[in-house]
């Protein structure tokens, strides 16, 4: 997980910072574009079907931290991934749902995805 | 053999209403996910949504809410395509897709239905 | 969402040539890239998935690559029969998206 904000310097820090924004830009924003003095985020969060949605956008520096922490949440698949190296560098960002744990296949017979490398196809 | 055999070719006007079936054979239904592509005429392919086999819940593109069902008769192995008031631009063949459940490839295809909407 | 921009349009080949296609995504997607093979009047047909894997029984001469933003798939010698539109997808975030096709044309 990439949390550049926490080994950037304060002073490479832009003051203020663009990132692309997708199902997250404010009513202001123009080409899928916010504006933050804080993060840039992608995050990947499931819906009750079990679709992938990635979403994009702004974090302002007051409380992100923590959001960039991507605390686990109980019965929620999602991941977030946070940077501030340079504008709009969430298009880089390339968050993966965290593996299921036992108790969820409870909703259902679930196949892994497998990242970076080779799948067995079943 | 793994196989989705869909119904056949539509013919309807603007404001009816159509509904497709794909019929799968050769694995267990609820294991996968049942995907919905549209292809108009000379076209590329377009991901309308799915429905998780084994949960019965469908998830929408948005251009494709509101109109548009999925649905399922498991101890039939068929999922269904209903499209509401049907439009000119309806006009496209329809493809059913298997995918494995949390894996976005479709791995078998069904045979395809078109539907023509004219009046 | 992701945009899968795909070149060319359209190749015209002798039959023993290779060829290359490419599709460039608008956001990195990792591997989650598959690659299909459209005949003539048929359904898609799956070839490679997770970029790289070749899906059961197809041919050796379909290959795949890529990580990130920046994919290619490749036929080593091509044949008469992959007379054909090639398609990338996105298999990464709903909605998953489709590049607009290759149409490989046989001298």
């Known amino acids: 997980k990439k949390e550049d904000g926490e080994s950037t310097a304060p002073t490479a820090r832009p003051k203020v910072l663009r990132c692309k924004c997708h199902h997250h830009c404010p009513e202001d924003s123009v080409n899928n574009i916010c504006s933050t003095d804080g993060y840039c985020f992608t995050m990947i969060e499931e819906d009750d079907s079990g679709t992938p949605v990635v979403t994009s956008g702004c974090l302002g520096l007051e409380g992100s931290d923590f959001q960039c922490r991507d605390t686990p949440i109980p019965h929620q698949r999602r991941s977030i991934e946070c940077c501030t190296e340079r504008n709009e560098c969430n298009k880089d960002l390339h968050p993966t749902l965290p593996p299921l744990k036992d108790r969820d296949f409870v909703d259902g017979p679930i196949h892994h995805k497998h990242h970076h490398h080779h799948h067995h196809h079943h | 053999q793994i196989q989705l055999v869909q119904s056949g070719p539509e013919l309807k006007k603007p404001g009816e209403t159509v509904k497709i079936s794909c019929k799968a054979s050769g694995y267990t239904f609820t294991t996968y996910g049942m995907n919905w592509v549209k292809q108009a005429p000379g076209k590329g392919l377009k991901w309308m949504g799915w429905i998780n086999s084994y949960s019965g819940v469908p998830a929408y593109a948005d251009d494709f809410k509101g109109r548009f069902a999925f649905s399922l008769e498991t101890f039939a192995s068929t999922a269904y395509l209903q499209i509401n008031n049907l439009r000119d631009e309806d006009t496209a063949t329809y493809f059913c897709?298997?995918?494995?459940?949390?894996?976005?490839?479709?791995?078998?295809w069904g045979t395809g239905t078109t539907v023509t909407v004219s009046s | 969402s992701f945009v899968m921009t795909q070149t060319p349009k359209f190749l015209l080949v002798s039959a023993g040539d290779r060829v290359t296609i490419t599709c460039k995504a608008s956001?990195?997607?990792?591997?989650?890239v598959a690659w299909y093979q459209q005949k003539p009047g048929q359904s898609p047909r799956l070839l490679i998935y997770?970029?790289?894997n070749r899906y059961t029984g197809v041919p050796d001469r379909f290959t795949g690559s890529g990580y990130g933003t920046d994919f290619t798939f490749t036929i080593s010698t091509v044949q008469a029969e992959d007379l054909a539109v090639y398609f990338c997808q996105q298999d990464y975030s709903s909605p998953f998206t489709f590049g607009s096709g290759t149409k490989l044309e046989i001298k």
């Open positions: 897709a298997r995918s494995e459940l949390r894996n976005w490839y479709f791995d078998v």
């Open positions: 997770f970029a790289s």
């Open positions: 956001q990195n997607l990792g591997n989650d």
